[in-house]
Interface confidence: low
Amino acid sequence: QSGPLPKPSLQALPSSLVPLEKPVTLRCQGPPGVDLYRLEKLSSSRYQDQAVLFIPAMKRSLAGRYRCSYQNGSLWSLPSDQLELVATGVFAKPSLSAQPGPAVSSGGDVTLQCQTRYGFDQFALYKEGDPAPYKNPERWYRASFPIITVTAAHSGTYRCYSFSSRDPYLWSAPSDPLELVVTGT
């Protein structure tokens, strides 16, 4: 085969958001018959020549960016997309509230606000059942998450996290859940 081998996939199970002391498995998946896998933590000298890394108890310094690649014969694959492994529960949980309130009419507006006693400059909002954080353009790193023109799809349970741009993979514990109810749908 000419050119680099196609990149493998790298995933964290059950999630890339891992509470301190909880287990997580990083799994690198390439095509069948791979000779060698290499899983590495970026910006460090750490790597292992195995496809699976089981972390029995998440720690602060295991948080960070990971990637993997594989070798067949003398050829190395392209690296996987980076996986951002986040340690949660490093800091006390923020509080999450809805303005003007957690019950909102369909078509109305609501703002979810994440607040903390600490001087964090970054916030992430997650909706239960969605693997990716809720992102509103240019408001990902703000304490306020406006939801304009609410629909039934916005109903659900939300949690937020706070963290610092200086240590972007060390997050607070999740806020208590906030149930957003959309009425009149």
């Epitope: 460090s44 000298s45 750490r46 029995p56 108890a57 998440m58 720690k59 310094s61 295991l62």
Partner: antibody, heavy 121, light 107 residues
């Protein structure tokens, strides 16, 4: 309370053997890598050995390789250091300390320490 | 092996002084560096991990900085309890290595 309680130190003749123990409590011992660090009288700290949480990886300082063996019994929450062919330069206070969960190499700084046990050769 | 060179080996200072201890690695260790405080007859106590993160229970007057090969431990205002020996340690690669120590004495 998180603690590491050490035992097994003493006086031994050159060429002799000794086994140090470190009993852990207050945390999930079986999830943590563990280390031994030593300090000769009036000297600085020297890392001695490491064992992975499940015992599958072990690393040693060159100065003790082939003479010392680190092991653990997770059912007893206990870490061991078997020291054979002891030399005068092995005289030191030996500390056990946690190494967190990790990959093929080390992961975090040591923040739980035993009180140390003196070995005199 | 990665050599850790600490300076000075002895430092005399007074209560209230701002004190700086430096540590140099023989090769880049990113930020995998810790600082410990040790008092005579006692086990070391973790002050700083990951070069600049304050360990749980460590007073806020201690701070760490640096990345790569050059690192610094700073005590913003020296207190009576701070007179001790300080060690840096790299945990980037095995064998793990410590600096030679800095003994902080009362002037």
């Amino acid at each position: 309370e998180v603690q590491l309680v050490q035992s097994g130190g003493g006086v031994v003749q050159p060429g002799g053997s000794l086994r140090l123990s470190c009993a852990a409590s207050g945390f999930t011992f079986s999830s943590y890598g563990m280390h031994w660090v030593r300090q000769a009288p009036g000297k600085g700290l020297e890392w001695v050995a490491f064992i992975r949480y499940d015992g599958s990886n072990k690393y040693y300082a060159d100065s003790v390789k082939g003479r010392f063996t680190i092991s653990r019994d997770n059912s007893k929450n206990t870490l061991y250091l078997q020291m054979n062919s002891l030399r005068a330069e092995d005289t030191a206070v030996y500390y056990c300390t946690d190494g967190w969960a990790e990959m093929a190499t080390t992961d975090d700084a040591f923040d739980i320490w035993g009180r140390g046990t003196m070995v005199t050769v | 092996d990665i050599q850790m060179t600490q300076s000075p080996s002895t430092l005399s200072a007074s209560i209230g002084d701002r004190v700086t201890i430096t540590c140099r690695a023989s090769e880049g260790i990113y930020h995998w560096l810790a600082w410990y405080q040790q008092k005579p007859g006692k086990a070391p106590k973790l002050l700083i991990y990951k070069a600049s993160s304050l360990a749980s229970g460590a007073p806020s007057r201690f701070s760490g900085s640096g990345s790569g090969t050059d690192f610094t431990l700073t005590i913003s205002s020296l207190q009576p309890d701070d007179f001790a020996t300080y060690y840096c340690q790299q945990y980037s690669n095995y064998p793990l290595t410590f600096g030679g120590g800095t003994k902080l004495e009362i002037k």
